[in-house]
Amino acid sequence: MAPWPELGDAQPNPDKYLEGAAGQQPTAPDKSKETNKTDNTEAPVTKIELLPSYSTATLIDEPTEVDDPWNLPTLQDSGIKWSERDTKGKILCFFQGIGRLILLLGFLYFFVCSLDILSSAFQLVGGKMAGQFFSNSSIMSNPLLGLVIGVLVTVLVQSSSTSTSIVVSMVSSSLLTVRAAIPIIMGANIGTSITNTIVALMQVGDRSEFRRAFAGATVHDFFNWLSVLVLLPVEVATHYLEIITQLIVESFHFKNGEDAPDLLKVITKPFTKLIVQLDKKVISQIAMNDEKAKNKSLVKIWCKTFTNKTQINVTVPSTANCTSPSLCWTDGIQNWTMKNVTYKENIAKCQHIFVNFHLPDLAVGTILLILSLLVLCGCLIMIVKILGSVLKGQVATVIKKTINTDFPFPFAWLTGYLAILVGAGMTFIVQSSSVFTSALTPLIGIGVITIERAYPLTLGSNIGTTTTAILAALASPGNALRSSLQIALCHFFFNISGILLWYPIPFTRLPIRMAKGLGNISAKYRWFAVFYLIIFFFLIPLTVFGLSLAGWRVLVGVGVPVVFIIILVLCLRLLQSRCPRVLPKKLQNWNFLPLWMRSLKPWDAVVSKFTGCFQMRCCCCCRVCCRACCLLCDCPKCCRCSKCCEDLEEAQEGQDVPVKAPETFDNITISREAQGEVPASDSKTECTAL
């Protein structure tokens, strides 16, 4: 696998994509040398693609200058101006706007709810396995193992707060030291960034939209991975996070505070608790080696219980195990003591769908996983559609300018830091970085927010989630207060350190460049997005986990050569792009490698062959299904009924004819009209602003 796929015969060209402050872009293929390509990712205007779900009607346009694919699309407004409308038109427009706003908020609500249900579904499917990861004794001595456990557990339970709370309970029970917990927290930080990457996959239908959305989502991933890459070795060597947080915890005499305010949960909980309710203590109990918990179901059945404390006689191995000398006796054979037991009497059952089904956790989890992903996908498509119809003309201009414009000189540098604060504040309000970054993803996709602006918002989100954790820690009971606060502070300072590494100096904003590079690749080969997700969030952590279990020697034996190869490739790539003359002619490009090692093209052929058998069957129902299909098989003919992929094929076949891209349509109505969805006359009644 080439470090920067699809290099082909092209000479490295560092100036292909410019990104302002963010510095140099990853090399993109030189399209002039590949005229036979049917793909149009970084294509000149002759190959701008048509959104798959739109009509086969090709709107001929004069070839214009090549645009940077990262430039935000301009949604021009062809609707009647407000001043030109009659009273009836104005009233109609007003109510249309209100209707759209209500719909938008409604879909946004169900979008957030589906994220919550998705988290529950993941916990039901993989929660117990996640708990068992924690009961591995090697975590104490192996920070790398701690890191991958943090990643895997958070990916499996889809909630960094769940994995963090397990770590806190383990630390306060002395099953884990703070030192051993820090890499797990770092891993949890990585794991939580999978949610918005999954959300980005839902925007796979439109290449340019997907490019932006996927890059916008993965900027979070890259920030976390790069931070860990630098800060984990630093922490292992210096224990700076442990020392700083210990000093803070010891220097303050904290009083137990109040719980962090549940602002968004207040609105979503009434709905989500009707779907499913989980007993999250079970995962913690499994993590703490409680054998009985392994047979417990995560699905909460009883919501109202009466707890009665009573004393029972229990046998103990020896008198030393007695509760106290006076509460110790024998029957002549066994030693007995009296133990306080809490007897739980079930009073009222929970009110959720699965309460009376008595299905295994895996079955409930699978059902919820499928349903929540469908709702998530549906809501996302509808949000994007509504935003697309609202954010046109003046509205779009105002919003884009407000969000993406910097402060005037000399305060331009402050804009990013304000965005960090906004991200932190918003995350604090919604109480979840996943929710905030997932809501951000479609906005990046449709071009309301630039990646450059989304980056500090995402970093702020990382900070926001740790402030929530600090507040939650302050509300912990006495015995857990110290450990939970120290861990929350470790999380906080880890993110602060990451920001200091990858934000203040524009040159160091590597996550943006890496995300854009991945965006380009994923827009061209859409299956690569899924491949990336599996590799980075499952395969690499599982491989490291497996190697760590085999012991340090095995881990080092396999890891060192791999790391050496990666460093070698990176150095070579750097030299190729900066000073190729230093290198021998053979090493000035990647042509010395076989094609499959330097390009994704052969792999694409393999994937296409593999998915070919599904193409005819994979979706013949709706556009939603088509988006999922197109993601998997990148196929031109997989959607017979919605015709979305056939359109794509036609657009690609007529390469010599410039096709008007969806983002250059005068407004969404034109595209719908072209499909025969609305009568042509309707375009005149389209309301352009709220």
Epitope: L327, T330, G332
Partner: antibody, heavy 120, light 107 residues
Amino acid sequence: QVQLVQSGAEVKKPGASVKVSCKASGYTFITYNMHWVRQAPGQGLEWMGAIYPGSGDTSYNQKFKGRVTMTRDTSTSTVYMELSSLRSEDTAVYYCASSTIITTGAVDYWGQGTLVTVSS
Amino acid sequence: DIQMTQSPSSLSTSVGDRVTITCKASQDVGTAVAWYQQKPGKSPKLLIYWTSTRHTGVPSRFSGSGSGTDFTLIISSLQPEDVATYYCQQYSRIPLTFGGGTKVEIK
């Protein structure tokens, strides 16, 4: 009603072994511990050990360890106590006693006792 | 082993009198103490367990008290049939141990 019937009196020579039996009836034999307590003439009571007939688990007084063996036969609801390497000071009345007060070492039903005389 | 020291070793009193027998443990035994009555030539009979719980069929004139190391058996009104030797027993630790016994006689 609960009854514990012990085997008859025994006269043994020093160094020999004696095996006293105790047949239980009137209750679930395997459920309750069976204790052996002895009483030397004109002396107090001395606990020798106990057996749980359900599993055959035993517990002995350290003083008799190595010399005493307690066994049970669940088919006949009988418990046996064998004392080896007899000495003259082992002359005593040997009682089997059942503890039906669950989880306690208080014994509520006693056999009639078996007199074991050790004499050369 | 836990030593159980009973006192007095014997006592002679009249019918209807209140009789108090004490038992001292060499270490804390909580409330794991039982009292037995043994009439001459007979097997012992359980009177009280858990320091103060009367066994089935035991007359109410027999009562027990105490905790830790000091225990007492009280016969509130001595009857002719109460003439016997009384033993205390601890079942806090293995081996179970008995007191030396208190012989109760009627004057």
